[in-house]
């Protein structure tokens, strides 16, 4: 069998709820970025998430070796009927994956989007959001996901989660 | 041109409706896995579904290489809506992704959730789930795909589907 | 470091706005393709788009080398709720991803699909469709993307995107 | 301050029938959905009917369907649970509970069925 | 239906000490699951939702956690007014369902 562990390049790191070492720093909500970035990845739980040749640094994902990356992540919103006044019924989930580059504002490569259901009859709702595709990443650029509606996130290590690997 | 074709590992498997070979065997329901297993995945489609150095048992893919996969699946749920006496019966559609190791239990990778339009409105829903990420698999390890909600699950092979490649 | 870059068979080509050299051509809405094909895709936008041993023609990605290819696509479907009087609001959208062989009829490789929302206090809608799944492909071969509803197609080049990598 | 406030408890004889209500205030009433819940003495909590914000839906365990109804009217901020054939073992106390995943209770009034 | 099984049923502890209940669902629930805390002649109060989201002004010695269809109350350090009977509620489907009661008694 032919060894392919010199030439992996990926990472998988997955939610993780409340830990103190991942925390958001203050600088999470960037002007420059919609949303909210998620800072609270883990990634050395054991059969679920790793780094193989990529570092994990303020919820961003740091690129050592230029090249073409898929890229990819889920995020889980989760949300119920809740009585708070002066709240719209409708929520606008959003996903947006960034890059920093060389360039001192973070440039978005993908967004995906869902709204909620409208109906004064809805009791709850859930909401997968996926998106991945591939994009040229080089040294030191680094990769992040922001979110709307940050606090309705499950960060359950199955549920939402961000990736990348090396094509090629 | 390069040789390619010794390196690959990879599979793509479709669904497949009613063939005799491919029903839920009885144990496709797995008390300590969530939701109910699909096994009626077809993997010689000609153009559509195949097995490349991966092998199919019992719905479930087996691992011949160890290495980091990129395990991905749709699933489409389709399906009328009823109203019974002004009950709305909401239905949570969940995919789960799941990995049998030398561990007896079954350990969930992955999962992707929606639920159905609350709206009395609605005459039928429409929803396709779609997840993928990256994992360490060793060989003889065995993945699978569950749902919740089965019977309203298009298996289609265009509209269902599961597959893997191994990355690096 | 290794060097990769002769290896690469990759695209990630983006959503594109009324740029005249990306407008359908006649031939876009292929009767014997579900949908409507999107031709107006941009491949040479630094840092978000990029063809590497792939061409692009009318909308269409031609395959240079045999093997499997990972293929996806993101399509983001948004569009303002109009009340219409005893009209049912109800939207289908589906977003097709087809292959051309030898065969003259274009071969349906994955499909997924979403319905709007039922409720008559539906404002606005915003959905976004992602999916991928590996295929064989042959020298020559092209795939393309087509979607039901393609009015409501945001192309941003974040929002709306196709591509495509070899595997192995 | 969400207030939730249940009356027409009391005494009734087996087969009989009895309407409670439940005054809510503090929130946007007709946006929510409402639940009654109770209690016999002693035991655990039993769900006992639902109603959705819009009004639209209704929803009751199996072993009440058709004895019991849930309604409720959005002009006055009232929630009904009207009880028909009621039996003994329907002594308990109800609540009232807002919005469907029952953020808030009401005090509770007893229903003693009893001849 | 959706069973919650709810242990255990009864459990004597001391002021101070750390306190576990679980709950478990017999289907998936998707973290739609609270706590419920009640005292005689009191109302009945929420203290967790959404399987571990804490209500406001509830102390922040009780949290709720979950692994799989297995849901956990926790009290870090038992108080004199935690003494009361605490039930799980499960709101993902009809019929709701509750768990069968843990009374924490002084010991």
């Known amino acids: 069998v032919r060894e392919r562990g010199p030439q992996r390049v990926a990472a998988h790191i997955t939610g993780t709820r409340g830990r103190s070492n991942t925390l958001s720093s203050p600088n999470s909500k960037n002007e420059k970025a919609l949303g909210r970035k998620i800072n609270s990845w883990e990634s050395s739980r054991s059969g679920h998430s790793f780094l193989s040749n990529l570092h994990l640094r303020n919820g961003e994902l740091v690129i050592q070796e230029k090249g073409f990356y898929y890229i990819y992540s889920q995020t889980y919103f989760r949300f119920q009927e809740e009585i708070k006044e002066n709240t719209k019924n409708d929520k606008q989930m959003v996903q947006y994956i960034y890059k920093y580059t060389s360039y001192p504002d973070p440039i978005l490569l993908m967004k995906s989007a869902r709204n909620s259901c409208w109906s004064k009859d809805a009791e709850y709702g859930l909401y997968s959001i996926y998106q991945g595709g591939l994009f040229e990443l080089k040294k030191d650029d680094r990769i992040f996901v922001s979110v709307t509606n940050e606090h309705l996130i499950d960060m359950d290590h199955e549920a939402s989660f961000f990736g990348a690997f090396l094509v090629g | 041109v390069r040789e390619r074709g010794p390196q690959r590992v990879a599979a793509h498997i479709t669904g497949t409706r009613g063939r005799s070979n491919t029903l839920s065997s009885p144990n496709s329901k797995n008390e300590k896995a969530l939701g109910r297993k699909i096994n009626s995945w077809e993997s010689s489609r000609s153009g559509h579904s195949f097995l490349s150095n991966l092998h199919l048992r019992n719905g479930e893919l087996v691992i011949q290489e160890k290495g980091f996969y990129y395990i991905y699946s749709q699933t489409y749920f389709r399906f009328q809506e009823e109203i019974k006496e002004n009950t709305k019966n909401d239905k949570q559609m969940v995919q789960y992704i799941y990995k049998y190791t030398s561990y007896p239990d079954p350990i969930l990778l992955m999962k992707s959730a929606r639920n159905s339009c609350w709206s009395k409105d609605a005459e039928y829903g429409l929803y396709s789930i779609y997840q993928g990420g990256l994992f360490e698999l060793k060989k003889d390890d065995r993945i699978f795909v569950s749902v919740t909600n089965e019977h309203l699950i298009d298996m289609d092979h265009e509209a269902s589907f599961f597959g893997a490649f191994l990355v690096g | 470091v290794r060097e990769r870059g002769p290896q690469r068979v990759a695209a990630h080509i983006t959503g594109t706005r009324g740029r005249s050299n990306t407008l359908s051509s006649p031939n876009s809405k292929n009767e014997k393709a579900l949908g409507r094909k999107i031709n107006s895709w941009e491949s040479s936008r630094s840092g978000h788009s990029f063809l590497s041993n792939l061409h692009l023609r009318n909308g269409e990605l031609v395959i240079q080398e045999k093997g499997f290819y990972y293929i996806y696509s993101q399509t983001y479907f948004r569009f303002q709720e109009e009340i219409k009087e005893n009209t049912k609001n109800d939207k289908q959208m589906v977003q097709y991803i087809y292959k051309y062989t030898s065969y003259p009829d274009p071969i349906l490789l994955m499909k997924s699909a979403r319905n709007s929302c039922w409720s008559k206090d539906a404002e606005y809608g915003l959905y976004s469709i992602y999916q991928g799944g590996l295929f064989e492909l042959k020298k020559d071969d092209r795939i393309f993307v087509s979607v039901t509803n393609e009015h409501l197609i945001d192309m941003d080049h974040e929002a709306s995107f196709f591509g495509a990598f070899l595997v192995g | 301050e969400v207030q939730l406030v249940e009356s027409g408890g009391g005494l009734v004889q087996p087969g009989g029938s009895l309407r409670l209500s439940c005054a809510a205030s503090g929130f946007t009433f007709s946006n929510y959905g409402m639940s009654w819940v109770r209690q016999a003495p002693g035991k655990r909590l039993e769900w006992v009917a639902t109603i959705s914000g819009g009004g639209s839906y209704t929803y009751y365990p199996d072993n009440l369907k058709g004895r019991f109804t849930i309604s409720r009217d959005n002009a006055k901020n009232s929630l009904y649970l009207q009880m028909n054939s009621l039996r003994a073992e329907d002594t308990a106390v109800y609540y009232c509970a807002a919005p469907t995943a029952m953020d808030y209770w009401g005090q509770g009034t007893l229903v003693t069925v009893s001849s | 239906d959706i069973q919650l099984t709810q242990s255990p049923s009864f459990l004597s502890a001391s002021v101070g000490d750390r306190v576990t209940i679980t709950c478990r669902a017999s289907q998936e629930i998707s973290g739609f699951l609270s706590w419920l805390q009640q005292k005689p002649g009191k109302t009945i109060k929420r203290l967790i939702y959404?399987?571990?989201t804490l209500d406001s002004g509830v102390p922040s010695r009780f949290s709720g956690s979950r692994s799989g269809s297995e849901y956990t109350l926790t009290i870090s350090s038992l108080q004199p007014e935690d003494f009361a009977t605490y039930y799980c509620?499960?709101?993902?489907?009809?019929?709701?369902?509750f768990g069968g009661g843990t009374k924490v008694e002084i010991k």
């Open positions: 509620l499960q709101y993902a489907s009809y019929p709701r369902t």
């Open positions: 959404a399987a571990s």
